[in-house]
């Protein structure tokens, strides 16, 4: 049993926070082996068609070992690789990038408000997304409602599958996610010196199978291990299934249950027919939506990483399943990025840097459509400030796949919370369109002209209207509609039942109907087709914009060398909340016309900027604008005022280097920098570097 194989105990050296590559590998080798060995077991069990419960147990243990390996890999990485989260969050809160929502009422966990800087950054991240995806790929953008009637989410599988188990503090009603709480409790018990080897082994076994327990098993475990509220020590209620969607009622009567959408995708699927028409009935095409989604997380803990309301940007790329080839794949084929295939995960390997073209050629990535999107996602994420070295694409293992996916790669970023998913890129096959077509009896298909007509064998149900009408009266229409859209596979299966048992049962719209030989038979005939119906496959890149934004915070947060107090965000200019600051060196009135003129010119050029004419020293004002990630700074100094042509200095936030240029040129220089048309190196090559004041005044721009 999996119980016999807890994660391998580590050599003492493993406790060090970082070490050289060879030393780290020595520590990781037994953990990698433990993962590989468990991977062998999972494969063997599947090969032997072992009972699913045994496979699930082994898979749970495999995941547990993978977690141990990953945690150790992270622990062994150099400490300077990890952001000082407390310091960063202090800056974010202090400068009102964001704050907890309803803070003056005590706040609500998992809900956040973005302040002016955070809001600007978020808008720029979204705007860059629109340019990078919607404009580049000519994607059809739509905007659907957040309120969704229950039948839609019943059909999509969310009502049944979108749930976690929850326990409640019996006295104060505080809720906890059952699996998280049990895990924390067992880990605490296991860390006790008095815990026997047998007990430890037993608990390891429980932890390994945590994802597989049902409601009753969890309830028993909570009793066996005497789990209490970690906060009050009070008793806990037995686990109950908790759907993560926010339920509501549409309209005053209370008879139309609905939910706040858990993803934006469903709106696109439901409008597929209209979108296909809009695209002149041709595949492939893509639709996108940016908007808020909602998940009623039981006890959100990790700041912006786990929230109850979050902005998503989702693309649904509809493609003919027989033509999963992207014409623009060559544009990204030469990108080198970290890929962490399912195969690598079960063999205890790390993510490996690979050329995208090779990954598709070698079958690591299934097709060029998926490959193209992975490449474009990579380019987008790095463009907005995510470090390529802290970004990987991890393939879901078979058992992790969402209920709708057949292949899935997550873009994951390395943060102080470990590796977190920031973009999912799923091949949803034809799951959603098929489900909604079945439920609504609306064929969600595209027609494809055949190169030459073909004769096909057709298998259909031939129902007896009279017999069905007699048996099911007003429900007969329901039955007939259902029978009209059944596929060949299903019809053949039912035909066997009809022949063996004389009847079969169908279920539609929550009702069950029994059909007997006198009500139905199966008709087979040939038909000539000039077009064929295609149920499109869907490739879905789904972006968690809040998580992307959080990653950008971590990957761009720095402390100035030699000055622990000076922190700054090195946001790429394209997403920086303000592209530049305008800083008059003195509050002297003669500086003001230049400030006004420059500010107006920047506005005309569409450059968001911030004027800081407060009385602090110039160094302190630079520090203040650096702290909110302002990309560039224009300083109006005494030379601006006293010399013609009027020039000012332009400072680069990251290098703190400055050039001098005419005021009239600065707006277009900053605009070009902000749009990514030129780099700071280009600017330095064209303009003289500025290193100190030329007018003999005490206050200088030097930092």
């Amino acid at each position: 049993s999996a119980a016999s194989c807890p994660p391998i105990s580590l050599p003492a050296a493993a406790s060090r926070s970082s070490m050289d590559g060879a030393g780290a590998e020595e520590v990781l080798a037994p953990l990698r082996l433990a993962v590989r060995q468990q991977g062998d077991l999972v494969r063997k069990l599947k090969e032997d068609k072992a009972p699913q419960v045994d496979v699930d147990k082994a898979v749970a243990e495999l995941k547990a070992r993978k977690r141990v390996l990953e945690a150790k890999e992270l622990a062994l990485q150099p400490k300077d690789d990890i952001v000082d989260r407390a310091k960063m969050e202090d800056t974010l809160k202090r400068r009102f990038f964001y704050d907890q929502a309803f803070a003056i009422y005590g706040g609500v966990s998992g809900l956040y408000d973005f302040g002016p800087v955070g809001c600007a950054l978020k808008n720029n991240i979204i705007q860059t997304w629109r340019q990078h995806f919607i404009q580049e790929e000519q994607i059809l953008e739509i905007d659907c409602t957040m309120l969704t009637p229950e039948p839609v989410l019943k059909t999509s599988g969310h009502v049944d599958k979108f749930a976690d188990f929850m326990v409640k503090d019996v006295k104060n009603g505080e809720c906890f996610r059952a699996d998280h709480l049990l895990k924390a409790h067992l880990q605490k018990l296991m860390s006790d010196k008095k815990c026997s080897v047998e007990k430890k082994s037993e608990m390891e076994s429980v932890l390994a199978q945590l994802d597989n327990y049902g409601q009753q098993e969890l309830a028993d475990l909570f009793v066996n291990y005497n789990v209490k509220s970690p906060i009050t020590g009070n008793d806990l209620s037995p686990p109950v299934s908790f759907n993560l969607m926010f339920k509501t009622f549409i309209g005053p009567g209370g008879n139309m249950p609905g939910y706040l959408r858990p993803e934006t995708a469903q709106g696109i699927f439901l409008n597929f027919k209209r979108l296909l028409e809009f695209n002149q009935g041709k595949l492939p095409f893509a639709a996108a939506q940016i908007g808020n989604s909602f998940r009623n997380e039981i006890s959100p803990r990790s700041g912006l990483i786990r929230v109850r309301e979050f902005t998503m940007a989702e693309i649904e790329h509809f493609v003919d399943p027989s033509e999963k080839d992207h014409p623009k794949f060559q544009n990204v084929a030469d990108l080198h990025l970290y890929l962490y295939s399912a195969k690598a995960q079960v063999s205890g390997q790390s993510a490996r840097k690979m050329r995208l073209g090779d990954a598709v050629e070698q079958g690591v990535i299934n097709n060029t459509v998926l490959g193209y999107f992975i490449g474009r996602i990579y380019l987008y994420l790095t463009k907005v400030g995510i470090s390529p070295d802290k970004l990987r694409f991890r393939q879901h293992m078979e058992n992790e796949m969402a209920h709708y996916a057949c292949d899935c790669w997550d873009a994951e970023s390395k943060t102080s919370y470990g590796w977190i998913e920031i973009v999912g890129c799923a091949d949803r096959s034809c799951y959603d369109l098929s489900c909604h077509a079945r439920a609504t009896k609306v064929p969600l298909v595209a027609e494809k002209p055949l190169k030459e007509p073909k004769t096909v064998n057709v298998v259909q149900f031939e129902p007896s209207k009279g017999a069905i009408g007699k048996a099911y009266k007003k429900d007969a229409k329901l039955v007939m509609e259902y029978l009209a859209i059944c596929d060949e596979c299903y019809i053949t299966e039912m035909e066997m039942l009809l022949n063996e048992k004389g009847e079969f049962t169908i279920e539609t719209e929550g009702k069950t109907f029994q059909l007997t030989k006198d009500m139905i038979n199966v008709k087979r005939f040939q038909k000539t087709l000039y077009v064929e119906e295609v149920v499109p496959n869907v490739i879905e890149p789904s972006f968690g914009l809040g998580r992307i934004m959080y990653t950008v915070f971590e990957h761009t947060f720095h402390v100035r060398e030699g000055d622990e107090q000076r922190t700054f965000f090195s946001f790429p200019a394209v997403v920086a909340p303000f592209k530049c600051s305008v800083l008059p060196l003195s509050q002297n009135q003669e500086f003001m016309p230049f400030v006004k003129e420059l500010s107006e010119a920047l506005t005309r050029h569409g450059v968001s900027h911030k004027v800081d004419d407060s009385s602090g020293s110039i160094g302190r004002r630079y520090a203040r604008t650096d702290e909110i990630g302002v990309a560039f700074g224009v300083t109006i100094d005494f030379d601006t005022v006293n010399k013609t042509p009027h020039t000012a200095t332009l400072r680069d936030r990251d290098s703190m280097r400055q050039i001098r240029a005419e005021i009239s040129e600065l707006p277009s220089i900053v605009q070009d920098l902000a749009n990514g048309n030129i780099t700071w190196a280009d600017v330095e090559a064209r303009y003289p570097l500025f290193e100190g004041q030329e007018t003999g005044k005490k206050e200088t721009i030097e930092e």
Partner: antibody, heavy 116, light 110 residues
């Protein structure tokens, strides 16, 4: 059908060298750890060495450390065991087997005799 | 001297149930999976039981494995003459970073 076929065994003098090969077929060779196990005449099984799929990790029994080298060529679906400084006690049938610990498939073995 | 200890021999009559034990330590059986192998005379070993108690496809359900602490056992019920063979237990040893076998048990069907 999974098949493992050892070759390269034979008679060798003490101190001599021999290279065993194991040709694999019927499965994705590059996905699996592979091992060598030996059995001296009339004796029990003894694990000798193992190697990870990417050649990154190699494991040896104390009795052969420093003398034997395991390697693989995934492009040829072949596992190797280079045996140097052979001793009389290395006389055995050498089997190659799949994985480091399951040994769910075995070859038919190749006999190595170390004798003067 | 093998790291895992097995009785050198065992016997039983057809139809009987026979058990073979295998004792080790926490670095092998205690914290790793146990496998059992059957070696018929003159042939290569064959995997009989893996990961303590799983049977590969094709192995009759008369063979079963179990484990408790640092010991494991193989049970054969409804003994048949074709079960006459050598049986080996084995497990990965985390301390040695290698695989260890028991000395083998010769099963005779009387």
């Amino acid at each position: 059908e999974v098949q493992l076929l050892e070759s390269g065994g034979g008679l060798v003098q003490p101190g001599g060298s021999l290279r065993l090969s194991c040709a694999a077929s019927g499965f994705t060779f590059s996905d699996y750890d592979m091992s060598w196990v030996r059995q001296a005449p009339g004796k029990g099984l003894e694990w000798v060495s193992a190697i990870s799929p990417d050649d990154g990790s190699k494991y040896y029994a104390d009795s052969v450390k420093g003398r034997f080298t395991i390697s693989r060529d995934n492009s040829k679906n072949t596992l190797y065991l280079q045996m140097n400084s052979l001793r009389a006690e290395d006389t055995a049938v050498y089997y190659c087997a799949r994985t480091t610990w399951l040994f769910d498939y075995w070859g038919q073995g190749t006999l190595v005799t170390v004798s003067s | 001297q093998s790291v895992l200890t097995q009785p050198p021999s065992a016997s039983g009559t057809p139809g009987q149930r026979v058990t073979i034990s295998c004792t080790g330590s926490s670095s092998n059986i205690g914290n790793n999976y146990v496998n059992w192998y059957q070696q018929l005379p003159g042939t290569a070993p064959k995997l009989l039981i893996y990961a303590d108690s799983h049977r590969p496809s094709g192995v009759p359900d008369r063979f079963s494995g179990s484990k408790s602490g640092t010991s494991a056992s193989l049970a054969i019920s409804g003994l048949r003459s074709e079960d006459e063979a050598d049986y080996y237990c084995g497990a990965w040893d985390s301390s040695l970073s290698g695989y260890v076998f028991g000395g083998g048990t010769k099963l005779t069907v009387l």
